[in-house]
């Protein structure tokens, strides 16, 4: 029950996180004009990963896409890449985790398969979350660097007569959305990985014992039947080794994970 709850909660948390990563990636407010020096501006600038916008006091808002690819800063391209990779991995992770959910029955899928899928999706969520956090952090670092650079030469003028105020940018809402969303995806991934441990069947390592019947050299391996968890269709008896003459050394092996596929 706890495993199902952990897995379900991990899935929901990751789903919210990935939705947040998508939202952050699409948002225009990655950086917003710093109003410290001019709190009464009639023109407000803000920028996203894909376009920059200007909102006027009149209510008119104009956004322009970055139609160049080569002319964009490498850091911005890197942030875009990280966010897209995060979304793609997260989306695949969600798809995998849907089938891995303990509460969803798909044919005769065994717990071991679901455990593997849960682990896979968990890892994908963790990497997705890390990509988002990294992307947002790189952008934030870029902003901080540019902020202090523009503060250093805030005003440039001719004999102090004419002032050209340089527009400074500070953290936009998308950064906080991205950080939170990345964190949630990461937490969701960790929860999926924890759930995976509970999903994996309890395996007791018994030594294989050989029984030699006269005329037949058939080896049977105790524990050769899959332990049923009482959930799903695990009731079929599976014989690991078919009859056949084998040496004792061959037969007396520890059960490996391949024995339970």
């Amino acid at each position: 029950m706890a495993v199902t709850a952990c897995q379900g909660l991990g899935f929901v948390v990751s789903l919210i996180g990935i939705a947040g990563i998508i939202a952050a990636t699409c948002m225009d407010q990655w950086s917003t004009q710093d109003l410290y020096n001019n709190p009464v501006t009639a023109v407000f600038n803000y920028q996203g990963l894909w376009r920059s916008c200007v909102r006027e006091s009149s209510g008119f808002t104009e956004c322009r896409g970055y139609f160049t690819l080569l002319g964009l800063p490498a850091m911005l391209q890197a942030v875009r890449a990280l966010m897209i990779v995060g979304i793609v991995l997260g989306a695949i992770g969600l798809l995998v985790s849907i089938f891995a959910l303990k509460c969803i029955r798909i044919g005769s899928m065994e717990d071991s398969a679901k455990a593997n899928m849960t682990l896979t999706s968990g890892i994908m969520f963790i990497v997705s979350g890390l990509c988002a956090i990294a992307g947002v952090s790189v952008f934030a670092n870029m902003l901080v660097t540019n902020f202090w650079m523009s503060t250093a030469n805030m005003y440039t003028g001719m004999g102090g007569m004419v002032q050209t105020v340089q527009t400074r940018y500070t953290f936009g809402a998308a950064l906080f959305v991205g950080w939170v969303a990345g964190g949630l995806t990461l937490i969701g991934g960790v929860m999926m990985c924890i759930a995976c441990r509970g999903l994996a069947p309890e395996e007791t390592n018994y030594k294989a014992v050989s029984y030699h019947a006269s005329g037949h050299s058939v080896a049977y391996k105790p524990g050769g039947f899959k332990a049923s968890t009482g959930f799903g269709s695990n009731t079929k008896n599976k014989k690991i080794y078919d009859g056949g003459a084998r040496t004792e050394d061959e037969v007396q092996s520890y059960p490996s994970k391949h024995d339970y596929v």
Epitope: C53, S57, G59, R64, V162
Partner: antibody, heavy 118, light 113 residues
């Protein structure tokens, strides 16, 4: 047709109060930022105050800050300017204007004259 | 506050002549976000409210004759009338639309000789 009609002007004593109204028609009033601009007799134009679309932000000229209050009633399509502690230098024709692209004022009312005199 | 200074204060020209008036701001009106200059030009004829001619320094308002043109960037702006007509007699104002308080120039009065 866009129309802005100011009213409420008149003669008032120094220290007195007056409330100007601007009735808007011919456009979606609630979707526009509105301003008041004044012009003293024989002088140039002076921006007085601006109220943003939702009414949440208001801006004032230093000369009227603390004395004048701009407000709007979107349900009545009306812009207001409450003027308190009036001074002789507030004597002017007050225009109601609509802001558009570039924060420019594309439509102006005919104006209402406010005279502050004892 | 941004100070707007217009020159000349007044000018008298003959009909059909080309006229140029200037407007200078104490701070740049160029917005880096969209590379637009937040300056507008108005025409005020005697006994009338002002009329918008240009916004974003050079974007002509609909209904404004094409003999009028606006130019300039940063801190220096110009309003040009290629061929002055009798109906162009008015006072012309430039305005800072970039930051509050919105400020107007003192105006340039255009007269016919």
């Amino acid at each position: 047709e866009v129309q802005l009609l100011e009213s409420g002007g008149g003669l008032v004593q120094p220290g007195g109060s007056l409330r100007l109204s601007c009735a808007a028609s011919g456009f979606t009033f609630s979707s526009y930022t509105m301003s008041w601009v004044r012009q003293a007799p024989g002088k140039g134009l002076e921006w007085v105050a601006t109220i943003i679309i939702g009414g949440s932000y208001t801006y004032y000229a230093d000369s009227v800050k603390g004395r004048f209050t701009i407000s709007r009633d979107n349900s009545k399509n009306t812009l207001y300017l409450q003027m308190n502690s009036l001074r002789a230098e507030d004597t002017a024709v007050y225009y109601c204007t609509r802001l558009v692209k570039g924060n420019a004022m594309d439509y102006w009312g005919q104006g209402t004259l406010v005279t502050v005199s004892s | 506050d941004i100070v707007m200074t217009q020159s000349p204060d007044s000018l008298a020209v003959s009909l059909g002549e080309r006229v140029t008036m200037n407007c200078k701001s104490s701070q740049s009106l160029l917005n880096s976000g969209n590379q637009k200059n937040y300056l507008s030009w108005y025409q005020q004829k005697p006994g009338q409210p002002p009329k918008l001619l240009f916004y974003w320094a050079s974007t002509r308002e609909s209904g404004v004759p094409d003999r009028f043109s606006g130019s300039g960037s940063g801190t220096d702006f110009t309003l040009t009338i290629s061929s002055v007509q009798a109906e162009d007699v008015a006072v012309y104002y430039c305005q800072n639309d970039y930051s509050y308080p919105f400020t107007f120039g003192q105006g340039t009065k255009l007269e016919i000789k």
